[in-house]
Amino acid sequence: ALDTNYCFRNLEENCCVRPLYIDFRQDLGWKWVHEPKGYYANFCSGPCPYLRSADTTHSTVLGLYNTLNPEASASPCCVPQDLEPLTILYYVGRTPKVEQLSNMVVKSCKCS
């Protein structure tokens, strides 16, 4: 699987999940988020050669087509597969508010 366990431990040029830390205050200007200060959002990148974690028959065919026709622009894209939520804490006035934000952390990628 093209997940963090594999991708973060290997120098993989092809489609894989890559580490990306986002600081809420410095990177996004969200000064009001109290905790966490930031988090590993991660992202997917890298080429999708034939049979590389193909998501659908279409992406398999597209990957084969691109392998056999390297000059063609059509090829599968490396995109998130599994995402996890992130819990944040902020204050409304002096009242703490905890929210779970869905699909915030990329855990694995696929070619689609």
Epitope: G29, W30, K31, W32, G93, E99
Partner: antibody, heavy 121, light 111 residues
Amino acid sequence: EVQLVQSGAEVKKPGASVKVSCKTSGYIFMKYWMNWVRQAPGAGLDWMGQIFPAWGSTNYNEMFEGRVTLTADTSTSTAYMELSSLRAGDIAVYYCARGYGNYALDAMDYWGQGTLVTVSS
Amino acid sequence: DIVMTQTPPSLSVSPRETASISCRASESVDSYGNSFMHWYLQKPGQSPQLLIYLASNLESGVSDRFSGSGSGTDFTLRISRVEANDTGVYYCQQNNEDPLTFGQGTKLELK
């Protein structure tokens, strides 16, 4: 230049709902909280609630008894305020106003031009 | 809810004089070393505009004839050398507690 442009005046019957839009430009919509404030004729300002457009978090003033729903469309940088079960006491100018950016509840540094909602049978 | 009481309700000032508006909160609006109190002016037929942020910080583009002071529960907005363009209704606002609340307004007129 930061701009908040609201939809036009509305006339509604008692018991109906109204939905006011606030189209923004000149800043990153998903970076700031958007507040809604109402002002009855000749009266002061009442905070209705707020929304964080990036993922739709909302905080409401209990004064509005769950009649207010705030939404946002990030693709068009537009915020919406819907008020249901309208009554005569809801006749007011409704403003959208951008939060200053340091806190969730905050001062408001840019305001829309206001939308007059009239309730009449 | 925190109740904001402004005095006076209305004020008539001669040009070039100084006007003072008071705002008293029903409980302290101070937290974490800040006073969560702000001031707005609503000119006739217009939307409110932010003048003073966090009790004493002048908002960008606002004349330095406006100044704010105070802490805890008692705050003051001062307008020096009053001009015709300063007429309108002034509001204080707190955001230390949910819900955010405004004062009832002070109407400033020129003599």
